[in-house]
């Protein structure tokens, strides 16, 4: 058993049918010695008397808010949560496996640049009685500071019969140098509590591997005289690291017809302009990627050909 | 893919060109190592990230773009080092920091070159003959060093008398390639920045 926060305790339960459970001793936080009784949640059934209460925690029915009283007055509370292990594996029931980039991916993180700021998000089908708390650090043995905000509900989606909820959190490395070469990964730890169930999820990454630039901005077309060709120009996104000559991007320019089946023409360039043939009803899209370290491409920025 | 390059300052061009070749070569070698050594811990998640140049060179600090010198976090470990004359830049442009930066890059390349050559000698003794270093990568390191044209004592190749542990050598190769790729990215950024300024 360990303390999650004041008066909230997590009991680690290795569960299997007929498991003996964990013996837990609760102590009433009071100088009083006599006439103390214990109850669980809203029940008035007295579970025991005395300054300490010994319970055998075998299942969620044994978890909840234990309260010690004296003469009708509440002395203290202890909320017991369960962290369940089955077949040697800690439960991961609260969050959905996003399966990207690999199975058992519960947390996904992205950074728009090398400033040390990143966003992580996760999915759940649970809508109520749910709390998250997020901690992060650079490295784990001698951790350096990363400050995370509060997790917030960032999107709701309907998937068939199901509603899916997306939560996200923003974190910032306390002293980040954009040019630094990372040797220790960022560690992100999310504590999830649903009803009386505690679970924790972790992710470990280098900022360089989670870079996804914003799409190029100010995408413009300039028709070339007496030609079907157009000059496409764009700019680096505002959120990208500076100076741009050091943090350079490479770009992919795509001409796409109205139908998804039509052949796409693609050009790669390091410049912020390109000359392409504009077909009727087609659109031109440009996306960006770090020129030297191939992490994710940005989303597309698009303009119609007409 | 071939990266189109803007017409560079003729003084800087060889280094920019060679640094792009270097990044391409080390990335290809790393990809080959990950495929060939698929049953070894060779991915970024599995290896320990070691930097053989740590405390010996200060490339990131010495090559910091001017715009980032205002960032306190980038100046933590900034230290001065010896100055030598490099030929990548026309001499009128060679400032104290630039010379320091380029000499630091040269020292990095020299250190990695020695490590890779020592390692290759061991890998050639492996009866499995599973993986060797790409000669192209070694050649590209050499070309960039020549373009940088710094005078420096040659470091003798490390020789060891004991029987090599091929498993450990292959793990070390992965660690080295990952670190060298990260340094090659920094070198490429630096050359691009110097070329633009």
């Amino acid at each position: 058993i360990w303390e999650l926060k004041k008066d909230v305790y997590v009991v680690e339960l290795d569960w299997y049918p007929d498991a003996p459970g964990e013996m837990v001793v609760l102590t009433c936080d009071t100088p009083e010695e006599d006439g103390i009784t214990w109850t669980l949640d809203q029940s008035s059934e007295v579970l025991g008397s005395g300054k300490t209460l010994t319970i055998q925690v075998k299942e969620f029915g044994d978890a909840g808010q234990y309260t010690c009283h004296k003469g009708g007055e509440v002395l203290s509370h202890s909320l017991l949560l369960l962290h369940k292990k089955e077949d040697g594996i800690w439960s991961t029931d609260i969050l959905k496996d996003q399966k990207e980039p690999k199975n058992k991916t519960f947390l996904r993180c992205e950074a728009k640049n090398y400033s040390g700021r990143f966003t992580c998000w996760w999915l759940t089908t649970i809508s109520t009685d749910l709390t998250f708390s997020v901690k992060s650090s650079r490295g784990s043995s001698d951790p350096q500071g990363v400050t995370c905000g509060a997790a917030t509900l960032s999107a709701e989606r309907v998937r068939g019969d199901n509603k899916e909820y997306e939560y996200s959190v923003e974190c910032q490395e306390d002293s980040a140098c954009p040019a630094a070469e990372e040797s220790l990964p960022i560690e992100v730890m999310v504590d999830a509590v649903h009803k009386l169930k505690y679970e924790n999820y972790t992710s470990s990454f280098f900022i360089r591997d989670i870079i996804k630039p914003d799409p190029p901005k100010n995408l413009q077309l300039k028709p070339l005289k007496n030609s079907r060709q157009v000059e496409v120009s764009w700019e680096y996104p505002d959120t990208w690291s500076t100076p741009h000559s050091y943090f350079s991007l490479t770009f992919c320019v795509q001409v796409q017809g109205k139908s998804k089946r039509e052949k796409k023409d693609r050009v790669f360039t390091d410049k912020t302009s390109a000359t392409v043939i504009c077909r009727k009803n087609a659109s031109i899209s440009v996306r960006a990627q770090d020129r030297y370290y191939s992490s994710s491409w940005s989303e597309w920025a698009s303009v119609p050909c007409s | 893919r071939n990266l189109p390059v803007a017409t560079p300052d003729p003084g800087m061009f060889p280094c920019l060109h060679h640094s792009q070749n270097l990044l391409r070569a080390v990335s290809n070698m790393l990809q080959k190592a990950r495929q060939t050594l698929e049953f070894y811990p060779c991915t970024s998640e599995e290896i320990d990230h070691e930097d053989i140049t740590k405390d010996k060179t200060s490339t990131v600090e010495a090559c910091l773009p001017l715009e980032l010198t205002k960032n306190e976090s980038c100046l933590n470990s900034r230290e001065t080092s010896f100055i030598t004359n490099g030929s990548c830049l026309a001499s009128r442009k060679t400032s104290f920091m630039m010379a320091l930066c380029l000499s630091s890059i040269y020292e990095d390349l020299k250190m990695y070159q020695v490590e890779f050559k020592t390692m290759n000698a061991k890998l050639l003794m492996d009866p499995k003959r599973q993986i060797f270093l790409d000669q192209n990568m070694l050649a590209v390191i050499d070309e960039l060093m020549q373009a940088l044209n710094f005078n420096s004592e040659t470091v003798p190749q490390k020789s060891s008398l004991e029987e090599p542990d091929f498993y450990k050598t292959k793990i070390k190769l992965c660690i080295l390639l990952h670190a060298f790729r990260i340094r090659a990215v920094t070198i490429d950024r630096v050359m691009s920045y110097l070329n633009a300024s």
Epitope: E59, G61, D161, L196 | -
Partner: nanobody
């Protein structure tokens, strides 16, 4: 929201068997831990058995262990309770429940309930 409908109850002789079914509709069935409870007239709701969302773990009340088997078919959105060696004291309304906590024998840990199906065991 999840809707639960029980079926399969009836009158049987002591020692006989019965299979109860609980069909779920609405939200994704495989997100829920499922349980069976029973309630005889004038008594509190009593836990019978529960099964985790994947169907890989089960949990039983001591009074039914070895006689009752809970199972589920996530493709059919159905949970079953196979009852054998029935006794007169098994007579009750059997209720199907869906929740998020497994294992739990406490009724208020379950969020959704069916209307129940009557099982009568005569001696």
């Amino acid at each position: 929201e999840v809707q639960l409908v029980e079926s399969g109850g009836g009158v049987v002789q002591a020692g006989e068997s019965l299979r109860l079914s609980c069909a779920a509709s609405g939200r994704s069935f495989s997100d829920y831990e499922m349980g069976w409870f029973r309630q005889a007239p004038g008594t509190e709701r009593e836990f019978v058995a529960s099964i985790n969302r994947r169907g890989s773990s089960t949990f039983y009340a001591d009074s039914v262990k070895g006689r009752f088997t809970i199972s589920r078919d996530n493709t059919k959105n159905t949970v079953y309770l196979q009852m054998s060696s029935l006794k007169p004291e098994d007579t009750a309304v059997y209720l199907c429940a869906a929740g998020w906590l497994f294992p739990s024998s406490r009724s208020r840990d379950y969020d959704y309930w069916g209307q129940g199906t009557q099982v009568t065991v005569s001696s």
